[in-house]
């Protein structure tokens, strides 16, 4: 098949680069003959510092190859990506990032966790790859629902909270208003729609403080809202159905003992919020004395019978509906309730199986007379909104 032309000279015998092979192997290469170079698995074709997918050289009329022999260079996955709120350890050896090298990602203990085992290998495609085939580094997700609080004490009939009791508690300050919210991720706050409705078009005017017990404490962690998402089924001024909103923060907050998200309820959590089961609500709202609390107060309150609650409010405020998206809590005898200024805060329950606290309700509305007998506090039933919450968080 050789094309011997008097005017052309044969090209030099190509020598395969280390960790590579040549095809086809011929006794002699003349004008227009070609060869390709293939690298062993774990090695890549490099022309200088530039990677190539394939390499073919052609013998020219002057007896030279049209391009120089490439190298087969060991795949180098390069330094692994940094892991926010975690770190990476080199398992194979210090800073070894070449083919088959192993690294181990891990999260800052106590406050962050990852779903995978965090072990990644430098594979032949040049990417750090997990055992599940994932090319992206893992994510250190904030731990949720850890609290030093044990069940025991609008907040009426409450007791002062201690550090670490309600690390998800967030203070929302407008120019003239105050409300609450609950951190549910490191950059999302759950609250009541009515508490932030006026701010929906001017999110940046909402001042968000967390990591505090004293309402006026100067030692707070400041967060700024990027966007407010009001539930599309909420109609301001026409009842409190779908009284739920999410605030996306501009930046992620660092999770620690005094700032931590509350968990969202698992599907099985409905069984933990039946009548007479106890939840806990905290806030800086009006106390029995009718003044805003200086210190974060909390109260442990039982879930009330839904039918009883519905009947009470039908009588008390005809036209005001207690819907299936709400749950009521309080004592028939009164004395324990949330009140004005607590709106948007979380009614939380302890999940006995996971030993984590989850948000079951959002402080929404109630009788003007906080803590009055037979007049329950009404809370947005969070479990009904898990798909809505997950949809907003995943899309924004």
């Amino acid at each position: 098949h050789h094309h011997h032309h008097h005017a052309s000279r044969p090209c030099p015998d190509p020598t395969a680069p280390p960790n590579g092979s040549i095809s086809p192997v011929q006794a002699i290469y003349v004008l227009k003959d070609r060869f390709s170079v293939f690298c062993k698995t774990g090695f890549e074709l490099l022309q200088g510092s530039v990677p190539l997918k394939s390499f073919t050289a052609v013998c020219q009329k002057d007896g030279s190859w049209d391009r120089p022999m490439p190298e087969c260079s060991i795949i180098d996955c390069g330094p692994p990506d940094d892991l926010p709120n975690g770190h990476v350890d080199y398992i194979t050896g210090p800073e070894v990032t070449t083919y088959k090298a192993v690294i181990q990602y891990s999260c800052e203990e106590t406050f962050y966790t990852m779903s995978s085992n965090g072990k990644y290998v430098c594979e032949a495609d040049g990417f750090w790859t997990s055992s599940k085939g994932e090319k992206l580094p893992p994510v250190c997700e904030p731990v949720c629902g850890l609290s030093t609080h044990t069940i025991g004490g609008r907040i009426v009939g409450g007791q002062p909270a201690k550090p670490g009791d309600f690390p998800w508690q967030v203070l929302l300050l407008g120019q003239t208003t105050a409300a609450a919210g609950a951190l549910i991720h490191d950059n999302w706050v759950l609250t009541a729609a009515h508490a932030v409705y006026e701010k929906r078009m001017a999110a940046s005017s909402l001042n968000i403080r967390m990591g505090i017990l004293k309402r006026l404490s100067p030692h707070y962690t400041q967060a700024w809202p990027e966007e407010i998402f009001i539930h599309e089924g909420y109609t301001h001024g026409a009842g409190f159905d779908n009284d739920i909103a999410l605030i996306k923060l501009k930046n992620k907050v660092t999770i620690n003992g005094s700032i931590m998200p509350v968990c969202l309820p698992r599907k099985e959590a409905a069984s933990l919020m039946r009548t007479d089961f106890t939840g806990t609500v905290a806030g800086w709202g009006l106390t029995q004395k009718g003044l805003l609390a200086r210190n974060l107060m909390f109260v442990d309150i039982p879930i009330a019978d839904h039918q009883k609650c519905t009947a009470v409010y039908e009588k008390l405020y005809p036209g005001v509906r207690v819907s299936a998206n709400m749950l009521c809590a309080g004592l028939e005898t009164g004395g324990k309730d949330s009140c004005r200024g607590d709106a948007g805060g979380a009614l939380v329950f302890l999940d006995n199986e996971t030993q984590r606290w989850f948000v079951g309700g959002i402080v929404s509305w109630g009788s003007i007379n906080c803590g009055a007998a037979d007049q329950y506090g009404v809370y947005t039933k969070v479990i009904n909104y898990i798909p809505w919450i997950e949809n907003i968080i995943s899309n924004f």
Epitope: G48, S49, V50, P51, R67, D125, G126
Partner: antibody, heavy 118, light 108 residues
């Protein structure tokens, strides 16, 4: 024929992020080669910024590594540059290019001029 | 990184004159991985010479390139008006890829 075409905003404010797109026609960016971003400053100095290879791996100029990200969309045969925290020193003409790897295969876009100014 | 120094920065030549410009690397570069580009005002750089001495398609044979190690040059055997431009050398022997600052060739 292989063609590369840059597109971008023209003007960016200091401290903001710059995003540029290179649309490639006549050749698939996954077929081979490294797809580069190069910039030319007002005094005509050329600087290689980085590349994304046919496999999606990236290599960056160490002087820009902390601010630079090059990504791609293979379905649109496009690759992108994102440069964070820009300053007036980033004012330049930005080119996307395939640089010849010892063969006569070298293509550049026509360049897009970027001014960083408040 | 490998610094490429081009000299002279600016030069002028008469029609028919022989022109040589140099590109000096701060560390050795494989001759396979040294390129020259030509750029005219308002245009993108054009590949002119690759692998130190191979002319890109469409480049007149009056151009030639040579060199090895740290010393490379581009030569025009007989200057023509169309050759007035800025010429840049580029190495891709090792990362980061680096360009020389350019030699601006003007017509006398």
């Amino acid at each position: 024929d292989v063609q590369l075409q840059e597109s971008g905003p023209g003007l960016v404010r200091p401290s903001q992020s710059l995003s540029l797109t290179c649309t490639v026609t006549g050749y698939s960016i996954t077929s081979d080669y490294a797809w580069n971003w190069i910039r030319q400053f007002p005094g005509n100095k050329l600087e290689w910024m980085g590349y994304i290879s046919y496999s999606g791996r990236t290599s960056y100029n160490p002087s820009l590594k902390s601010r630079l990200s090059i990504t791609r969309d293979t379905s649109k045969n496009q690759f992108f540059l994102q440069l964070n925290s820009v300053s007036s020193a980033d004012t330049a003409t930005y080119y996307c290019a395939i640089i010849s790897t010892a063969v006569d295969f070298d293509y550049w876009g026509q360049g897009t001029t970027l001014t960083v100014s408040s | 990184q490998t610094v490429l120094t081009q000299s002279p920065a600016i030069m002028s030549a008469s029609l028919g004159e022989r022109v040589t410009m140099t590109c000096t690397a701060s560390s050795s570069v494989s001759s396979s991985y040294l390129l020259w580009y030509q750029q005219k005002p308002g245009s993108s750089p054009k590949l002119w010479i690759y692998s130190t001495s191979k002319l890109a398609s469409g480049v007149p044979v009056r151009f030639s390139g040579s060199g090895s190690g740290t010393s490379y040059s581009l030569t025009i055997s007989s200057m023509e008006a169309d050759d007035a431009a800025t010429y840049y050398c580029l190495q891709y022997n090792r990362s980061p890829l680096t360009f020389g600052a350019g030699t601006k060739l003007e017509l006398k």
